[in-house]
Interface confidence: low
């Protein structure tokens, strides 16, 4: 079987190997990499290029969100002949080059993952010596960050007609299922999940009418774990007190 594209089978990890005349620019990245929040992830990226034995200045760049225009999260530069790519930008100090760009490897390590890192990343290399050329992955690699649930806010708010309602917001990936339990609610009342617009990892559940004083508990659960938080409702003289 032969691909309709040119098959690049030179050893990308050995700079002594001559590129074939037909060698072209290409980037090899996986469609997706998964890791848990708090852990580290490797974003693999290797490339081929048509410039035989290029050893001039080069810059390696990773950007997030969209190709060509997304914000840079990592950038390093290697001087002519040097295998050391000196870091010029590492967002929050969490991005570290694992690969050697001189050996056609731009693989990146992302430390201390957060849910906000869940996006698509694009690698790019720029030659700037006798040869001026550049190439960037168009589809990139999607970093999928998973996380156990964490309740980020729980509160009791007044609602019309001297009633009270409770709100619980949690984050996690997969998005957690939320359930309320409390006085006169029975063991557990599953609430409708409603991911907030623009906040794909945040889920909010509302308990619209708190009819009894006491402790109301919100439980958030997904395949990675569960989390609980409580509020207390005490009504005296038309006022409420809530504590978590």
């Amino acid at each position: 079987f032969v691909r309709t594209k040119i098959d690049t089978t030179e050893n990308l990890l050995n700079t002594e190997v001559h590129s074939s005349p037909a060698q072209r620019w290409s980037m090899q990245v996986p469609p997706e990499v998964s890791a848990e929040a708090g852990d580290a992830a490797v974003l693999p990226c290797t490339f081929t290029h048509p410039h035989r034995h290029y050893d001039g200045p080069l810059t390696a760049i990773w950007r997030a969100g969209e190709p060509y225009a997304g914000p840079q999260v990592f950038r390093c530069a290697a001087a002519r002949g040097s295998e050391l790519c000196q870091t010029a930008l590492s967002l929050h100090g969490r991005f570290r080059l694992l690969g050697n760009p001189r050996r056609n490897d731009l693989s990146l390590r992302v430390e201390r993952l957060a849910l906000a890192d869940d996006r698509r990343y694009f690698c790019r290399v720029e030659f700037a010596g006798d040869v001026h050329d550049r190439y960037e992955s168009r589809h990139g690699v999607r970093l999928h960050v998973t996380a156990a649930p964490r309740i980020v806010n729980i509160s009791v708010l007044p609602s019309p007609a001297h009633a009270f309602r409770a709100l619980c917001t949690a984050e996690g990936e997969p998005p957690p299922a939320l359930a309320w339990s409390g006085p006169a609610l029975g063991n557990s009342l599953a609430a409708v999940r409603s991911p907030r617009e623009g906040h794909g990892h945040l889920v909010t559940a509302e308990l619209p009418a708190l009819t009894h004083d006491g402790r109301y508990t919100c439980t958030a659960a997904n395949s990675l774990g569960r989390s609980e938080a409580s509020v207390y409702l005490f009504r005296f003289h038309g006022a409420s007190g809530a504590s978590t």
């Epitope: 090899q28 693989s107 168009r138």
Partner: antibody, heavy 122, light 106 residues
Framework: QVQLQQSGAELVRPGTSVQMSCKAA????????IGWVKQRPGHGLEWVGD????????NNNEKFRGKATLTADTSSNTAYMQLRGLTSDDSAIYYC???????????????WGQGTSVTVSS | QIVLSQSPALLSASPGEKVTMTCRAS?????MYWYQQKPGSSPKPWIY???NLTSGVPARFSGSGSGTSYSLTISRVEAEDAATYFC?????????FGGGSKLEIR
Amino acid sequence: QVQLQQSGAELVRPGTSVQMSCKAAGYTFTNYWIGWVKQRPGHGLEWVGDIHPGINYTNNNEKFRGKATLTADTSSNTAYMQLRGLTSDDSAIYYCARVDYDYDGSYIMDYWGQGTSVTVSS
Amino acid sequence: QIVLSQSPALLSASPGEKVTMTCRASSSVSYMYWYQQKPGSSPKPWIYATSNLTSGVPARFSGSGSGTSYSLTISRVEAEDAATYFCQQWNSKPWTFGGGSKLEIR
């Protein structure tokens, strides 16, 4: 030409482990991912995971977490898959395949091994 | 995970007929990939990125579709086309395959 040669059929006892191999030839082993696919009659094809020998990075199907371990030996151009805690559900043909992630997003398993048949029986 | 449902599971055609098999995804995918498998053999890559034929695949095969609905069409079936065809997505992990469409030639 590109070839992936897989190890021979295995007949194993429940609860034991098995390791199968996939020897690559005809291309630069460290440039491409090697994927593993499970096929059971009536169950179609199932992706187990893949490994990039050049940077020793693996992608895994969560379903096979704790079941399958992927490794690669660049000195012998060989990828390995170990299956542990075998049950009858693990009886299947397991294929290795070279995975070509093209620059324009055209991903494909372009070359396949002949498959290793695993039968779990007491 | 993205579930791929292929239909029909079994289809029978006479040489020269036009045949279409479909693959529906439970969520939208960017591209669809197709593999051909004959009994006792490994799967072979057949169509990549929805509509591109891999080298050596006869021009009577074509692929099309977008979003959640994709299809593989054979304009004039020949005896050598008898096989099972699997669709596959690379859009989201875990990469998944359809259950297959088996083509028999009468």
